[in-house]
């Protein structure tokens, strides 16, 4: 058993049929010595008396808010949550495995630039009695500060018969150094509490590996005189790190015909303009990636050829 | 470069960008291999990193690029020695067309561009002997290449910025 926060405790249980459970001793936070009784949740049933209460915690029915009373007045509370371990593995019932980039990916994180700011998100099908808290640091043995904001419900989606809820959080490294080579990874830890179930999820990454630029902006087409060709130009996204002579992007461009089956040639360039053949019903697209480190490509920015 | 002269920024830019490409060819991102799970805080501590105080940021380069260039050169020599060691020549066998060979030569080429004959900056201690088991050796290979990818990315940014803003 360990203390999650004041008056909230997590009991770690090996979860299998007829498991013996965990013996827990609760102590009433009071100078009083006599006439103390204990109850669980809203039930008025007295579980025991005295300054301490010893219970055997085996299942969710044994978890909840234990209160010690004297003369009809509540003296202190202890909320017990359960953290299940099945076959040596902590349960992951609350969050959905996003399976990208690999199995057992519950938290996904992205950064738009090297400023030390990043967003993490996760998915669940649970809609009520659910709370999350997030902590983050750079490195684990000698952690450096990362400040995370409040967790927000960022999207709701219908998947077949189920509703899926996406939660997200924004974090900022306290003293980021965008030009340095990261030596220690960022650690993100999410505590999830659903009713009386406690779970924790972690992710470890370098900012450089989660970079995904915003799409290039200001796509423009300029037809060339007496030619089927057009000059296309675009700009670095506003959210990308500066100066661009240092934090450079590379671009992938393509012209896509109306039919998705049509062969599309992709051209890679470090420039912010190109000359292409852009037929009437086609569209021109461009995406960006860090020029020197193969992190994610941005989403496509597109403009119709006509 | 030693003694405060300017490097051939444009040449360094080209070669460092080539290094980036080669480093990613030698070890593309492989989904299931999360090498940080193998206690990375210790493993990569002995490789040279370009840190915050090394003057490799745009402002630091404008003030005095020498500190940064010396740090880059130390790293290049360190990695060049690693890539030539039996970590990479032992099993699992690398074919002669492996990008590791070109990477090794390019690291040497760039470090020489930063230090013409006759000048000798103090260089970093070379790493300890490699493991004997193919499994450990392969893991170390992957870690070195992942770490090199990050190192050469910063070096390439430095030279790109230098070529654009500091060239005579």
């Amino acid at each position: 058993i360990w203390e999650l926060k004041k008056d909230v405790y997590v009991v770690e249980l090996d979860w299998y049929p007829d498991a013996p459970g965990e013996m827990v001793v609760l102590t009433c936070d009071t100078p009083e010595e006599d006439g103390i009784t204990w109850t669980l949740d809203q039930s008025g049933e007295v579980l025991g008396s005295g300054k301490t209460l010893t219970i055997q915690v085996k299942e969710f029915g044994d978890a909840g808010q234990y209160t010690c009373h004297k003369g009809g007045e509540a003296l202190s509370h202890s909320l017990l949550l359960l953290h299940k371990k099945e076959d040596g593995i902590w349960s992951t019932d609350v969050l959905k495995d996003q399976k990208e980039p690999k199995n057992k990916t519950f938290l996904r994180c992205e950064a738009k630039n090297y400023s030390g700011r990043f967003t993490c998100w996760w998915l669940t099908t649970i809609s009520t009695d659910l709370t999350f808290s997030v902590k983050s640091s750079r490195g684990s043995s000698n952690p450096q500060g990362v400040t995370c904001g409040a967790v927000t419900l960022s999207a709701e989606r219908v998947r077949g018969d189920n509703k899926e809820y996406e939660y997200s959080v924004e974090c900022q490294e306290d003293s980021a150094c965008p030009a340095a080579e990261e030596r220690l990874p960022i650690e993100v830890m999410v505590d999830a509490i659903h009713k009386l179930k406690y779970e924790n999820y972690t992710s470890s990454f370098f900012i450089r590996d989660i970079i995904k630029p915003d799409p290039p902006k200001n796509l423009q087409l300029k037809p060339l005189k007496n030619s089927r060709q057009v000059e296309v130009s675009w700009e670095y996204p506003d959210t990308w790190s500066t100066p661009h002579s240092y934090f450079s992007l590379t671009f992938c461009i393509q012209v896509q015909g109306k039919s998705k089956r049509e062969k599309k040639d992709r051209i890679f360039t470090d420039k912010t303009s190109a000359t292409v053949i852009c037929r009437k019903n086609a569209s021109f697209s461009v995406q960006a990636q860090d020029r020197y480190y193969s992190s994610s490509w941005s989403e496509w920015a597109s403009v119709p050829c006509s | 470069v030693p003694g405060g002269s300017s490097p051939a920024w444009a040449q360094c830019q080209q070669l460092s960008q080539k290094l980036c490409t080669l480093a990613w060819s030698a070890h593309p991102l492989v989904g299931h291999m999360d090498l940080r799970e193998e206690g990375d805080e210790e493993t990569t501590n002995d490789v040279p990193h370009i840190q915050c105080g090394d003057g490799c940021d745009p402002q630091g380069l404008r003030d005095n690029s020498q500190f940064c260039l010396q740090r880059i050169r130390q790293g290049l020599i360190f990695y060049e020695k690693l890539l030539g060691s039996d970590i990479f020549t032992g099993e699992p066998s690398l074919l002669p067309d492996s990008p590791v060979g070109q990477l090794h030569a390019s690291l040497l080429g760039l470090s020489q561009l930063l230090q013409p004959e006759g000048h000798h900056w103090e260089t970093q201690q070379i790493p300890s002997p490699s493991p004997s088991q193919p499994w450990q050796r392969l893991l170390l290979r992957f870690k070195i290449l992942r770490s090199l990818q990050a190192f050469v990315a910063v070096a390439a940014r430095v030279f790109a910025h230098g070529a654009a803003t500091l060239s005579p």
Partner: antibody
């Protein structure tokens, strides 16, 4: 896209020689090793060796030394494998293949195979 | 030479079954193992490399595991088109060697 096109099937007498070709396209021929494998009827695969066209250096499986010569012609982007002193046990489908770009020998692209039959 | 001993040499399974093929190397090859599928009359096709990394376009019902000397190819839910011979291959040490193959038949 990368393509490896091999020469057609051959029927040979014991004691004679055969030269199988593998024409490569869709990549820079001198950048990658070309490997040769064989598969006897109903049997598994055996690695014979490779040639690195950039420096014309072959490497052989010891079990095939003296039996096989691997060469490359840069001007036509073609690799060759010559088998000498043919015996009936050399009857097999011979494949050329090129490995992954990262320098390890897992084979992504294969030729269509050339059946060499040795029979008197 | 490193011997790659594959088992079973043949097996018959029904559509939807989970199928496992094993391969044992005669000495440590780290994870330098690839798996190939060869359909009747066709060229071998790469399925997995580094013991467990799926090649582009390979369905996710194919998975691999193992390191050192013991390796496994698993097909989680057998499909009719999986009828083929399967080969493991070590690329750790010269000469590169293959397992003798597993013939997979559909019941």
């Amino acid at each position: 896209q990368v393509q490896l096109v091999q020469s057609g099937a051959e029927v040979k007498k014991p004691g004679s020689s055969v030269k199988v070709s593998c024409k490569a396209s869709g990549y820079t021929f001198t950048d990658q090793t070309i490997h040769w494998m064989r598969q006897a009827p109903g049997q598994g695969l055996e690695w014979i060796g490779y040639i690195y066209p950039r420096d014309d250096s072959p490497k052989y499986n010891e079990n095939f030394k003296g039996k096989v010569t691997i060469t490359a012609d840069k001007s036509t982007s073609t690799a060759y494998m010559e088998l000498s002193s043919l015996r009936s046990e050399d009857t097999a489908v011979y494949y050329c293949a090129i490995p992954d770009r990262s320098g390890y020998a897992w084979f992504i692209y294969w030729g269509q195979g050339t059946l060499v039959t040795v029979s008197s | 030479d490193i011997q790659m001993t594959q088992s079973p040499s043949s097996l018959s399974a029904s559509v939807g079954d989970r199928v496992t093929i094993t391969c044992k190397a005669s000495r440590d090859v780290a994870i330098a193992v690839a798996w190939y599928q060869q359909k009747p009359g066709k060229v071998p096709k790469l399925l997995l490399f580094w013991a467990s990394t799926r090649h582009t376009g390979v369905p996710d019902r194919f998975s691999g595991s193992g390191s050192g000397t013991d390796f496994t190819l698993t097909i989680s839910s057998l499909q009719p088109e999986d009828l083929a011979d399967y080969y493991c291959h070590q690329y750790s040490s010269y000469p590169f060697t293959f397992g003798q193959g597993t013939k997979l038949e559909i019941k």
